[in-house]
């Protein structure tokens, strides 16, 4: 079976240019059209551009100024560069094979390569990824939070961009795993009791205690999965007002 | 009752691999839309997602740390396996296999395996 | 360019039932050769999109029968018969008839 490997760096600097690469296995590159697919995090697909193994190419217009596409038979990999980058390129980047020359439908993808255009190294804290950093960032807070028993609180997580209601909250207690509290941003899983709701849509959040029990005492996490990979607030340190 | 348990060498030095075995019960990886993976949290810190295998053998890894990582599953066996390597100081944590179903989200959770990477 | 234009953005359903989902462009997708080149893809979460129909109503290899397309000109549907759990993720309609080829901006399919 037809497989795709993109490869190339998963963050590069504003202004500079990206190069990527599509190796394919398990059948010849000739005698095809090969295309560059973006998305951005969340958000829809944009054809790049197609290439054919003799080397002629179409661009999208609205990136043709930008855009290089070259093939190497001998090595069965095709190329994209990509110049002047600008954060809004900032996107997982397919590379995807298509079934007969006119008709322009992609059988055969790669799994995707995800581009980061930052000027900074990317967060190394919380559900970030460390160095090439994730597309969505989230910011929860507070990161401490000094209650009661029978106290009402409220932990807020925000988003850098519009997740629907992909939100999950998980509560971890000293030297336990998390588990699950709130999916769906404000759907109970089973088993957890009523004083914990969650609210919110699109890039606000909120996971509310109706009445603090002393078994509440906990770190709380925020979680996104409306985009890939799949990332954590830095938590909420739930502790017993002295 | 869905149960996950990890398990780990616990200490290597700096450039070995790690291998982590997860065996869980309770719930088959050859369900349509079941997955596995696994999510670490050095001590102190918040978590990080690493890597996910699904029902179908798609597999999954953070962009950042993709050519690190591998995930592979013996379904017949109930487990699931993550190699990580080249190891360093960084990668001391706690590792956590958990379940994805439905929702997508990590719904069952094991008890962690701690790795001390130190020379 | 073609505009694609895809309602609802989010469908939640149940396991069984049916589900439906159009996909307009902004012009007709009909070729000079008569062909209307209009597509569908499957894109499950951290995945990159699967081709399920290919012109309009071409069931691409292995996708199940439940998986049906229709619709002509400026048009088109996808129908899902009986909703699995694995059928769950983004749905993109995609047009190839005008360059640059163009996509839908997704309907979410989701658990109710």
């Known amino acids: 079976q037809v497989q795709l490997q993109e490869s190339g760096p998963g963050l590069v600097k504003p202004s500079e240019t990206l190069s990527l690469t599509c190796t394919v296995s398990g059948g010849s590159i000739s005698n095809y059209y090969w295309s560059w697919i973006r998305q951005p995090a969340g958000k829809g697909l944009e054809w790049i551009g197609r290439i054919y193994t003799s080397g002629s190419t179409n661009y999208n217009p609205s990136l043709k100024s930008r855009v290089t596409m070259s093939v190497d038979t001998s090595k069965n990999q095709f190329s994209l560069k990509l110049s002047s980058l600008t954060a809004a390129d900032t996107a997982i980047y397919y590379c995807a094979r298509y079934y007969d020359i006119l008709t322009g439908f992609f059988d055969y993808w790669g799994q995707g390569t995800l581009v980061t255009v930052s000027s900074g190294g990317g967060g190394s804290g919380g559900g970030g990824s460390g160095g090439g950093g994730s597309v969505i960032w989230m910011t929860q807070s507070p990161s401490l939070l000094s209650a009661s028993t029978g106290d009402s609180v409220t932990i807020s997580c925000r988003m850098s961009q519009d997740i629907s209601s992909y939100l999950a909250w998980y509560q971890q207690k000293p030297g336990k795993a998390p588990e699950l509290l709130i999916y769906a941003a404000s759907s109970l899983q089973s088993g957890v009791p009523s004083r914990f709701s969650g609210s919110g849509s699109g890039t606000d959040f909120t996971l509310t205690i109706s009445s603090l029990q002393s078994e509440d005492f906990a770190t709380y996490y925020c979680q996104q999965y409306d985009s890939f990979p799949p990332t954590f607030g830095q938590g909420t340190k739930v502790e017993f007002k002295r | 009752q869905v149960t996950l348990k990890e398990s780990g060498p616990g200490i290597l030095k700096p450039s070995q691999t790690l291998s982590l075995t997860c065996s869980f019960s309770g719930f088959s990886l050859n369900t349509f839309g079941m997955g596995v993976g696994w999510i670490r949290q050095p001590s102190g810190k918040g978590l990080e997602w690493l890597a996910h295998i699904w029902w179908d053998d798609d597999k999954h890894y953070h962009p950042s740390l993709k050519s690190q990582l591998t995930i592979s599953k013996d379904t017949s066996r109930n487990q699931v396996f993550l190699k990580i390597t080249s190891v360093d100081t960084t990668d001391t944590a706690t590792y956590y296999c958990?379940?994805?179903?439905?929702?997508?989200?990590?719904?069952?959770w094991g008890p962690g395996t701690t790795l001390t990477v130190s020379s | 360019d073609v505009m694609m234009t895809q309602t609802p953005l989010s469908l939640p359903v149940s396991l069984g039932d049916q589900a439906s989902i159009s996909c307009r462009s902004s012009?007709?997708?009909?070729?000079?050769?008569?062909?209307?080149?209009l597509h569908w893809y499957l894109q499950k979460p951290g995945q990159s999109p699967k081709l399920l129909i290919y012109?309009?109503?071409n069931r691409f290899s292995g996708v199940p029968d439940r998986f049906s397309g229709s619709g002509s000109g400026t048009d088109f549907t996808l129908k899902i018969s009986r909703v699995e759990a694995e059928d769950l993720g983004v749905y993109f309609c995609s047009q190839s008839t005008h360059g640059p080829w163009t996509f839908g901006g997704g309907t979410k399919l989701e658990i109710k």
């Open positions: 012009q007709s997708l009909v070729h000079s050769n008569g062909n209307t080149y």
């Open positions: 958990v379940r994805r179903y439905r929702y997508d989200v990590f719904d069952y």
């Open positions: 012109k309009v109503s």
